[in-house]
C-alpha cells in the first residue's frame, strides 16, 4: 500500500512508525504554548508566533521554512473610541449601554491585547432607529417577513441571533432588505446546552460573553483590495469603494445579558411561530420598535472601526519528496486567533506541529515521503480566509499543476462525541480505510476502530454501515484550494452530537473564553480526542504523499454525481408546468453522469491491473486521478461568484459554511416561481444544466485511456 | 430559609492554624458558588476566597492564596477555610457567602465568627 | 485589580431626606456591581446587583443606577431602618472588591 522508495524502513512499518509517534502530551504542550497570550492576525504576538513555528519546524527537520508575507485589509476596533449599542430616550440621552468587552476569564484578569467584541470589517456609524428582530436573519426569515407579515426593514436596524448560517450572510440579507444597522447575539438556545454550566465552570457561553467575527461576503476573493492576485510588494489595489465584499452598513456583536435589555422592550407584532424563539425571557416580538411604554425610546449603534492595509505571514514548511518531488500534498491550518484560539485555531495548530515532528523524526531516520508534503500555518483565516488564499494566488500556477490534495486543520474539536469528515468524494475510500485501521478514543468502544464508533454514532443517511461524510462548504482556509483551484480536499475533527445538542458550532466559539482551560477541563482532558484527529489528519497526509498508487476512487465520485443530479432535478420538478413551457430538460446532465459513470469503472479496473513498475503509466495514472478534481473547474466561475469556479460543489449562496451540489443549477432554480421574467429565469436553468452537463462529460473523458 | 452558620472563631495565636467552618440550609448549596469575606472590626469588607459548585476551582486574594485553603463538602452542605500561618493583621470577622456563579454578587451571608490573632 | 472608591465615607441625614452614595471602578465594569447594606453588628445585606436591579424584599425606596466605572445608590425618604453602613462591590473579575464603604448616620 505504501511505498518504500528512496526509504530503509519497510511499508507496513511507514505509516505505523509515523503514526506510532504522535503523542497526545505533545499536542497539549504545544495547545498550552499556543493559546497564552492572544495572537490576533496583523499584530506583533502573531508574527512572534509565525517566527516561533518556522524555528521549531526547522528544529523538527523540515527541508526548508518560510516565511510569506502579504499586506492585506484587515479591521481593528479604535482603541480610544469604542464600539456599543445604546437605547436612548426622546430627549438622545443613552439610558443603557452594552458593555464595551467581556469580563475576563479567571487567571486572565491581567492579560493586554484582548480585542473587544466586533464584527469586523464593519463600516463607521452611529445609526439610531427602530429595532426588528429578524430571527436568525436566513434568507427565508427575511421571506417570512417582508412576504408573509408584511414588515419592512427598511430603514430599521435589526437584531439577529448567531447560528445556523453563516454571520456574514446575515449582514448580506439585513442590507438586501434595507437595513440600517445590524445587531448580532448569541441566544442561550443556541449556545447555551441544557444541564452544562457556563465558564469557567462548564463549556457554556455566559451571559457576558461574545462571538467576534467578520462579516465579508468575500466569495472566494481573499483580500478585498486584490481580488484574483496576491497582495505583494508591487500590488495595485482597489479603492476602498470598490473592494471586493465589504458590508455597507454597521455591524455589532453583543452577548445575551445585553440581547435580554434589547428584546424585553419589543413591541410590534408576535414572533410567527415557535421556530423564531430562543431562550431569554423575552417576547421575541418581531417590532418595529419597542412596546407602548418605552415606544419613544429608540436604538442608537455607534461604530468606529477602521479597516486597515496591514502584513500578514504565513509560515511555508517543506518536505521534500523521494520521488515525485513536483507533486505536493498540503497539508494546513491557521495561526490567528480572535483572542487565545483555545479551539479555533489553536487545537488544530497544534494537532499540525505533532504532525510535523513525527514527519521530522521519520525524516531525520532516514525516511522521505514519495511526493513532498507542505505544511502551512495560515494567518488572517479570521479575517475571510486571506492568508491562504493570498499564498494560493501567489502559487497558482505551480498547485494547479502539482497539487494532489489539501487538508485542512483548523479546529480538532468542536465537541467530543465522534468524528466529522468533509471531503471530495475521491477521499471516502482513503477516509474509510485509514479509521478502519485506527483505535477508537469513544468510551464504550474500547478495543474497537475508529470506523466503527463514527459509524453507529454518525451514519450515513444512504448507506447502511457506512458513516456520514459530508460535503464541503466554506468558512475555512480549504476554500481557495477546493472551490477556486480544484485541488482534491478534505478536513476532519471531533465533533458534538448533532442530535441532542441543537446549538450552532459550541458555545465559547471566538469568545474571550476560549481558553487552553476550556479544552483541558472540558472537552479532552486526556487529549485523546486530539490525538484522533492527528492520526485522521496526519494518516491521511501520509497516504496521500506516499502511496504509489494515489488513494482517490473516482468511482465514489459517480456514485455522488447521480444522488446530486437526481436531487437537483427534483427540485426542478416542483415546477413541472413551467419545465414543460420552456422545454426543460435534465436528459444531458444525466447522460453525462451516465458515461462518468461507465468510464470510471472502466478507469478503476486498469487501475487494479496495470504495471505500476512502470514509473510513466504509474505517473500517467496517478496525473488522471490528480486532475480529477480539476476537470470540474469551470474557468468562468458560477454567476456573479468567479472564485468559486468548482461546478460540482460550491459555497451555498444563502450560508457560506454550508456545500451546495451542483450549486450553478440550484442557485438558477432558487425561488424561481418570484422572479419578474420567468422566461429569463428558466433559460438561465437551462444554460447551467448545459454548463454541468458538460463539465461532468468533459471530466468523465479525462479519465479515459488516454489514446 | 436560607441560612448559613460559621463555627466558632476565637483567639488564636500568631504562626498557629484555624479550620472555619459553615454549614448551609435553605438552599441547594452545590448550585452555589461559595466565599469568604472578612472585617477587620470597625473596618470595611474584603473578599479572602471562592470555590465554584463543586469545588474544582478556587480563587483567592494573592496576598493569601499561600496560606489560606477554602474547599467544600456538597454532601454535608459545608463550607471551610483553612488559615494556616495566622498573623496579627488577619484577626477580623469571617463571614461565610453564597453567590449564584463566578461573575456574580453574594446574594447569602452568614452572621459572621470573630477570628482573633494574637500572642 | 480593580479599585472601588465610595463617597462619602460618612454622611449625616434626617428620616425622610433623600441621599445618594457614590461608587467609582478604577476600571470599566459594564454593570457587574452590586450594593450592600450593613447594621452595626451584623452580616451585610443584599441591595442591588447588576447596578440597578433591587434583591427580593428590598424596599423601592432603594435604587441602583450607573455603568461604566461611575455608579450611584439613591435613597428616597430614609427611614430609622436604614441608616447603618453601605458598600459597593464588583464582581467583573477576580479579585471582586468592595469600596471603603459609607457610614449613614441619623442627623
Known amino acids: 500500500k505504501s511505498s518504500n522508495e528512496a526509504t530503509n524502513i519497510t511499508p507496513k512499518h511507514n505509516m505505523k512508525a509515523f503514526l506510532d509517534e504522535l503523542k497526545a502530551e505533545n499536542i497539549k504542550k504545544f495547545l498550552y504554548n499556543f493559546t497564552q497570550i492572544p495572537h490576533l492576525a496583523g499584530t506583533e504576538q502573531n508574527f512572534q508566533l509565525a517566527k516561533q513555528i518556522q524555528s521549531q519546524w526547522k528544529e523538527f527537520g523540515l527541508d526548508s521554512v518560510e516565511l510569506a508575507h502579504y499586506d492585506v485589509l484587515l479591521s481593528y476596533p479604535n482603541k480610544t473610541h469604542p464600539n456599543y449599542i445604546s437605547i436612548i430616550n426622546e430627549d438622545g440621552n443613552e439610558i443603557f449601554n452594552t458593555s464595551l468587552f467581556e469580563p475576563p476569564p479567571p487567571g486572565y484578569e491581567n492579560v493586554s491585547d484582548i480585542v473587544p467584541p466586533f464584527s469586523a470589517f464593519s463600516p463607521q456609524g452611529m445609526p439610531e432607529g427602530d429595532l426588528v428582530y429578524v430571527n436568525y436573519a436566513r434568507t427565508e426569515d427575511f421571506f417570512k417577513l417582508e412576504r408573509d407579515m408584511k414588515i419592512n426593514c427598511s430603514g430599521k436596524i435589526v437584531i439577529a441571533r448567531y447560528g445556523k448560517v453563516f454571520r456574514g450572510n446575515k449582514v448580506k440579507n439585513a442590507q438586501l432588505a434595507g437595513a440600517k444597522g445590524v445587531i448580532l447575539y448569541s441566544d442561550p438556545a443556541d449556545y447555551f446546552a441544557p444541564g452544562v454550566k457556563s465558564y469557567p465552570d462548564g463549556w457554556n457561553l455566559p451571559g457576558g460573553g461574545v462571538q467576534r467575527g467578520n462579516i465579508l461576503n468575500l466569495n472566494g476573493a481573499g483580500d478585498p483590495l486584490t481580488p484574483g492576485y496576491p497582495a505583494n510588494e508591487y500590488a495595485y489595489r482597489r479603492g476602498i469603494a470598490e473592494a471586493v465584499g465589504l458590508p455597507s452598513i454597521p455591524v455589532h456583536p453583543i452577548g445575551y445579558y445585553d440581547a435580554q435589555k434589547l428584546l424585553e422592550k419589543m413591541g410590534g407584532s408576535a414572533p410567527p411561530d415557535s421556530s423564531w424563539r430562543g431562550s431569554l425571557k423575552v417576547p421575541y416580538n418581531v417590532g418595529p420598535g419597542f412596546t407602548g411604554n418605552f415606544s419613544t425610546q429608540k436604538v442608537k449603534m455607534h461604530i468606529h472601526s477602521t479597516n486597515e492595509v496591514t502584513r500578514i505571514y504565513n509560515v511555508i514548511g517543506t518536505l521534500r519528496g523521494a520521488v515525485e518531488p513536483d507533486r505536493y500534498v498540503i497539508l494546513g491550518g491557521h495561526r490567528d486567533s480572535w483572542v487565545f484560539g483555545g479551539i479555533d485555531p489553536q487545537s488544530g495548530a497544534a494537532v499540525v506541529h505533532e504532525i510535523v515532528r513525527s514527519f521530522g523524526t521519520l525524516k531525520k531516520e532516514g525516511w522521505r515521503p514519495r511526493r513532498t508534503i507542505l505544511f502551512a500555518s495560515w494567518d488572517a483565516e479570521e479575517f475571510g480566509l486571506l492568508g491562504s488564499t493570498e499564498w494560493a494566488e501567489e502559487n497558482s500556477r505551480l498547485l494547479q499543476e502539482r497539487g494532489v490534495a489539501y487538508i485542512n486543520a483548523d479546529s480538532s474539536i468542536e465537541g467530543n462525541y465522534t468524528l466529522r469528515v468533509d471531503c471530495t468524494p475521491l477521499m471516502y475510500s482513503l477516509v474509510h480505510n485509514l479509521t478502519k485501521e485506527l483505535k477508537s478514543p469513544d468510551e464504550g468502544f474500547e478495543g474497537k476502530s475508529l470506523y466503527e464508533s463514527w459509524t453507529k454514532k454518525s451514519p450515513s443517511p444512504e448507506f447502511s454501515g457506512m458513516p456520514r461524510i459530508s460535503k464541503l462548504g466554506s468558512g475555512n482556509d480549504f476554500e481557495v484550494f477546493f472551490q477556486r483551484l480544484g485541488i482534491a480536499s478534505g478536513r476532519a475533527r471531533y465533533t458534538k452530537n448533532w442530535e441532542t445538542n441543537k446549538f450552532s458550532g459550541y458555545p465559547l466559539y471566538h469568545s474571550v473564553y476560549e481558553t487552553y482551560e476550556l479544552v483541558e477541563k472540558f472537552y479532552d482532558p486526556m487529549f485523546k480526542y486530539h490525538l484522533t484527529v492527528a492520526q485522521v489528519r496526519g494518516g491521511m497526509v501520509f497516504e496521500l504523499a506516499n502511496s504509489i498508487v494515489l488513494p482517490f476512487d473516482c468511482r465514489d465520485y459517480a456514485v455522488v454525481l447521480r444522488k446530486y443530479a437526481d436531487k437537483i432535478y427534483s427540485i426542478s420538478m416542483k415546477h413541472p408546468q413551467e419545465m414543460k413551457t420552456y422545454s426543460v430538460s435534465f436528459d444531458s446532465l444525466f447522460s453525462a453522469v451516465k458515461n462518468f459513470t461507465e468510464i470510471a469503472s472502466k478507469f478503476s479496473e486498469r487501475l487494479q491491473d496495470f504495471d505500476k513498475s512502470n514509473p510513466i503509466v504509474l505517473r500517467m495514472m496517478n496525473d488522471q486521478l490528480m486532475f480529477l478534481e480539476r476537470a470540474f473547474i469551470d474557468p468562468l466561475g458560477l454567476p456573479d461568484r468567479p472564485f468559486y469556479r468548482h461546478v460540482i460543489y460550491a459555497p451555498s449562496s444563502h450560508n457560506k459554511y454550508a456545500g451546495e451540489s451542483f450549486p450553478g443549477i440550484y442557485d438558477a432554480l432558487f425561488d424561481i416561481e418570484s422572479k419578474v421574467d420567468p422566461s429569463k429565469a428558466w433559460g438561465e436553468v437551462k444554460r447551467q444544466i448545459y454548463v454541468a452537463a458538460f463539465t461532468v462529460q468533459a471530466a468523465a473523458e479525462t479519465l479515459s485511456e488516454v489514446a | 430559609e436560607v441560612k448559613l452558620v460559621e463555627s466558632e472563631g476565637g483567639l488564636v495565636q500568631p504562626g498557629s492554624s484555624k479550620k472555619l467552618s459553615c454549614t448551609a440550609s435553605?438552599?441547594?448549596?452545590?448550585?452555589?458558588?461559595m466565599a469568604w469575606v472578612r472585617q477587620v472590626p470597625e473596618k470595611g469588607l474584603e473578599w479572602v476566597a471562592s470555590?465554584?459548585?463543586?469545588?474544582?476551582?478556587?480563587y483567592y486574594l494573592d496576598s493569601l492564596k499561600s496560606r489560606f485553603i477554602i474547599s467544600r463538602d456538597n454532601a454535608k452542605n459545608n463550607l471551610y477555610l483553612q488559615m494556616n500561618s495566622l498573623k496579627s493583621e488577619d484577626t477580623a470577622t469571617y463571614y461565610c457567602?453564597?453567590?449564584?456563579?463566578?461573575?456574580?454578587?453574594?446574594?447569602?451571608w452568614g452572621q459572621g465568627t470573630l477570628v482573633t490573632v494574637s500572642a | 485589580d480593580i479599585q472601588m472608591t465610595q463617597s462619602p465615607a460618612s454622611l449625616s441625614a434626617s428620616v425622610g431626606e433623600a441621599v445618594t452614595i457614590t461608587c467609582r471602578a478604577s476600571?470599566?465594569?459594564?454593570?457587574?456591581l452590586a450594593w450592600y447594606q450593613q447594621k452595626q453588628g451584623k452580616s451585610p445585606q443584599l441591595l442591588v446587583y447588576?447596578?440597578?436591579t433591587l434583591a427580593d424584599g428590598v424596599p423601592s425606596r432603594f435604587s441602583g443606577s450607573g455603568s461604566g466605572t461611575q455608579f450611584s445608590l439613591k435613597i428616597n425618604s430614609l427611614r430609622p431602618e436604614d441608616f447603618g453602613s453601605y458598600y459597593c462591590?464588583?464582581?467583573?473579575?477576580?479579585?471582586?472588591?468592595f469600596g471603603g464603604g459609607t457610614k449613614l448616620e441619623i442627623k
Open positions: 462591590q464588583h464582581f467583573w473579575s477576580t479579585p471582586p472588591t
Open positions: 447588576n447596578a440597578e
Open positions: 435553605g438552599f441547594t448549596f452545590s448550585d452555589y458558588y
Open positions: 470555590i465554584n459548585y463543586d469545588g474544582s476551582s478556587t
Open positions: 457567602a453564597g453567590s449564584d456563579g463566578y461573575w456574580a454578587w453574594f446574594a447569602y
Open positions: 476600571g470599566n465594569i459594564h454593570n457587574y
